[in-house]
């Protein structure tokens, strides 16, 4: 060994100076009398050596590095050797911090595992090898006096976390627990803990079920789940409350809590739910009133509550066949009395016969809005009813009266945009109690199965929007039926388009004749059409070669014009415009040619 | 200090009934399961039912079930045990117990002799 | 049901002894596993519970080991009024069973 490094300190501070020292021996002989020593750290040379011979013969180097910066690095005394670099010596020099208190220690009895678990935050990294102890001893009183200490528990390398086994501890009793960190640089000891692992419990959640549904026992309410809990057993005698959560399993909605709930609870009831809706229940407990942690979530138990009877008002309308005015189309709409007014699963039709006490006949049982029946020659009314599991919804009598009473006068209807109609009336004297709107295609297109209705309930309104099945560009029919207390007025009916379509194609135009000043055009009309309003006016446009135009303005009931004033043997591109106030659509256009000067007329 | 004192005990007939009490001073009684633990003349112990600290629990050995029932009246400090349809086996001394968190019996009375004969 | 299997049933020892008691669950119980000592005609005493804690007022001479299926009762230095019999419980399930009890007599 020609050279050997010795250091101030092999591990410092990050940022600190460290001193190093290189002696060549003299029995190099090989090397230059007066050789020069260079350091270098890592791959960088670093100049401010300071070079001595000793008395002894041998060459010493010495170097301050003001900061070491880095974490790790190797600090290489070197000579050059011909034209390169040789290292004689190097050491390993490491740079870092002291380790931080360790915080945040939190520990948790596990019963299962019989072991106390301790975890902790290490704090920032020290760069350095750090080691973790948790030490502990036990104390009878409030830890202020040490009892007897428990063997030093050591984490794996790189885990924040140590188990104590149950034969180091003493249930009921305090321990002090603490976490010692330590490296090169120094060492640290986080607050201690004074516990005793019991009040320090995490226990197991119980499992969560639905009850068994018993003969004898009242089926839940609508909105209410019937549940009960199997406490986990080994925590069976420890005193704990719990809670529980549960959520819709549909939709963003966040967990509701329920509790505080014993641990034993036979039987649960939950209400105030939503009914008819699949909820995710979960319960977890805690040791109480004694100290202790939260157990996790149980798993999760899924049920559905019960739905409730439909608590709806069922608007009703009917019609008579023209050919058999004993076949009766009834027509309903449920209106909701409740912000959740139960599921509807279908709807019954029936009839009470006079003298028949009890007996209802159904007439039909639907899940349409609507069925068509028979009704036998004695029925006046009929009842309607919407049903589910739960029940039914209290009882719409219909009654199939004559058009006993007055009608209303001056319906019209106008466009408010193009997928609504405005229907207005006068009401007549005295007030109905409300009306029955029907709207659907005009003719060609009508038909008495597709229409729309609505109930007005004030009698005292004077029109309606109508914004369902409304499309632009078709003829509506509105039917206006005045409701009274046991009769009904004359319907009275309107045509209406919410919005007319522009015409679809203007007509062709043809040259009837021609002169070398003039052209005389003529078309065929278009036939209306349904659904496009009718023309206002015709425009013709005509341009000359040199891109000049022109134009005219012609009533809707022109076949023809003539165009005056035009340059002889010129080109002429000329075509027409058909509006409406939907709107205005371009013909081809047609081109021509006037005559030549010397020419005769064209007829 | 703990006390648990157990009456009720006596000579009675097979298919006759009994009921034993167990009156408990010294500690918060209506936060502890409390149980009964049996021992026939010259056999070891044997557990007979236990019951949760509000009463809503009360498990029992299968060689009870459907004839004993375990109770207690928190205000009164006291648990019971109503033995009915008793059988010449059911003669034993009967301990009253306090258990622990861990289901260990903590405190126990002196016991009641109940001897079923005819 | 977990049945608790004690052993001996009976053994003899002079004060002074080290005397070992062992118990084996039929499943494994964790750590809920009690002690306790009985004497002729009076109430048992729950020396250990959850398998090795000693109990308020036990002298330290007694202790317990083992978790899951096997247990041992161990009293260090055995003294004229350990002279009993020991029984061990399993507290982690109902039915809570008892062993059948080692009888601790005078050699």
């Known amino acids: 060994e020609c050279g050997h490094i010795s250091v101030s300190a092999p591990i410092v501070h990050l940022g600190d100076p460290i001193t190093a020292s290189c002696i060549i021996k003299q029995n190099c002989s090989h090397l230059d009398p007066e050789p020069q020593i260079l350091w270098r750290l890592g791959a960088e040379l670093q100049p401010g050596g300071r070079q001595q011979r000793l008395s002894d013969g041998t060459q010493e180097s010495i170097i301050t590095l003001p900061h070491l910066n880095h974490t790790q690095a190797f600090l290489s005394c070197c000579l050059n050797w011909g034209n390169s670099l040789q290292i004689l010596d190097q050491v390993e020099l490491r740079a870092g911090y002291p380790p931080a208190i360790p915080h945040n220690l939190s520990c948790l009895m596990n019963l299962t595992t019989s072991s106390l678990i301790c975890q902790w935050e290490p704090g920032p990294e020290t760069h350095l090898p750090t080691s973790f102890t948790l030490k502990s001893f036990k104390s009878r009183g409030n830890c202020q006096t040490q009892g007897d200490s428990i063997l030093d528990c050591v984490p794996k390398d790189g885990q924040s976390h140590c188990c104590i086994p149950r034969k180091h501890l003493l249930l009921y009793q305090n321990m002090g627990i603490w976490v010692q960190a330590e490296n090169a640089l120094g060492t640290s000891m986080s607050p201690q803990l004074c516990l005793d692992p019991m009040d320090v419990v995490k226990l197991e959640p119980p499992m969560l079920r639905t009850m068994d549904p018993s003969p004898e026992a009242a089926p839940p309410q609508a909105g209410c789940l019937q549940l009960c809990w199997e406490p986990w057993q080994p925590g069976l005698h420890i005193n704990q409350k719990c809670e529980l959560r549960h959520k819709p399993q549909r939709g963003e909605a966040s967990w509701a809590l329920v509790g505080p709930l014993p641990l034993e609870a036979l039987q649960y009831e939950l209400c105030g739910l939503l009914p008819a809706t699949a909820y995710t229940l979960q319960i977890r407990c805690i040791r109480w009133p004694l100290p202790g942690h939260w157990s996790d979530w149980s798993p999760s138990l899924e049920l559905r509550t019960t739905e409730r009877a439909p608590t709806v008002r069922l608007d009703t309308w009917w019609r008579q066949r023209q050919l058999d005015p004993r076949t009766v189309q009834l027509f309903w709409k449920p209106v909701p009395l409740e912000e959740d007014s139960g599921r509807i699963q279908g709807y019954v039709v029936s009839w009470r016969p006079s003298g028949q006490a009890g007996a209802i006949l159904p007439l039909c049982n639907t899940t349409e809005l609507s069925c068509t029946f028979h009704l036998p020659s004695e029925a006046q009314e009929v009842a309607l009813v919407a049903y589910n599991s739960a029940g039914t919804s209290r009882p719409t009598p219909v009654v199939f009266s004559e058009s006993r009473g007055p009608a209303l006068t001056r319906l019209h209807a106008m466009a408010r945009d193009p997928h609504s109609l405005w229907v207005g009336w006068e009401p007549p004297n005295p007030w109905p109690q409300g009306y029955v709107i029907e709207w659907g295609l005009g003719p060609p297109s009508a038909s008495n199965s597709n229409k729309t209705w609505r109930m007005e309930q004030n009698g005292r309104a004077t029109g309606f929007l109508l914004k369902e099945n409304i499309r632009p560009f078709q003829l509506y029919e509105i039917i206006v039926t005045p409701l009274y207390q046991d009769t009904m007025g004359p319907s009275q009916h309107v045509y209406a388009y919410s919005q007319e379509m522009a015409p679809s194609h203007a007509p062709e135009l043809h040259l009837k004749h021609i002169g070398k000043t003039w052209a005389q055009l003529e078309w065929v009309p278009e036939p209306p059409e349904l659904g496009k309003s009718p023309l206002t006016h015709y425009t013709i446009f005509w341009t000359n070669a040199q891109n000049q135009s022109f134009s005219a303005i012609l009533n809707a009931s022109s076949r023809g014009f003539v165009l005056h004033g035009l340059e002889p043997a010129s080109l002429y591109h000329i075509h027409l415009m058909a509006a409406s106030q939907a709107g205005a659509t371009n013909s081809t256009v047609l081109t021509l040619m006037t005559l030549t000067p010397e020419g005769s007329e064209l007829h | 200090e703990v006390q648990l004192l157990e009456s009720g005990g006596g000579l009675v007939q097979p298919g006759g009934s009994l009921r034993l009490s167990c009156a408990a001073s010294?500690?918060?009684?209506?936060?502890?399961?409390m149980g009964w633990v049996r021992q026939a003349p010259g056999k070891g112990l044997e557990w007979v039912s236990s019951i949760s600290s509000s009463g809503g629990v009360t498990p029992y050995a299968d060689s009870v079930k459907g004839r004993f029932t375990i109770s207690r009246d928190n205000s009164k400090n006291t648990l019971y045990l109503q033995m009915n349809s008793l059988r010449a086996e059911d003669t034993a001394v009967y301990y009253c117990?306090?258990?622990?968190?861990?289901?260990?019996?903590?405190?126990w009375g002196q016991g009641t002799l109940v001897t079923v004969s005819s | 049901d977990i049945q608790m299997t004690q052993s001996p049933s009976s053994l003899s020892a002079s004060v002074g002894d080290r005397v070992t008691i062992t118990c084996r669950a039929s499943q494994g119980i964790s750590s809920y596993l009690n002690w306790y000592q009985q004497k002729p005609g009076k109430a048992p005493k729950l020396l250990i519970y959850y398998a090795s804690n000693l109990q308020n007022g036990v002298p330290s001479r007694f202790s317990g080991s083992g978790s899951g299926t096997d247990f041992t009762l161990t009293i260090s230095s055995l003294q004229p009024e350990d002279f009993a019999t020991y029984y061990c419980q399993q507290s982690l399930e109902y039915p809570q069973m008892f062993g059948g009890g080692t009888k601790v007599e005078i050699k």
């Open positions: 117990a306090k258990l622990g968190e861990l289901g260990q019996f903590m405190d």
């Open positions: 010294g500690f918060t009684f209506s936060l502890y399961w």
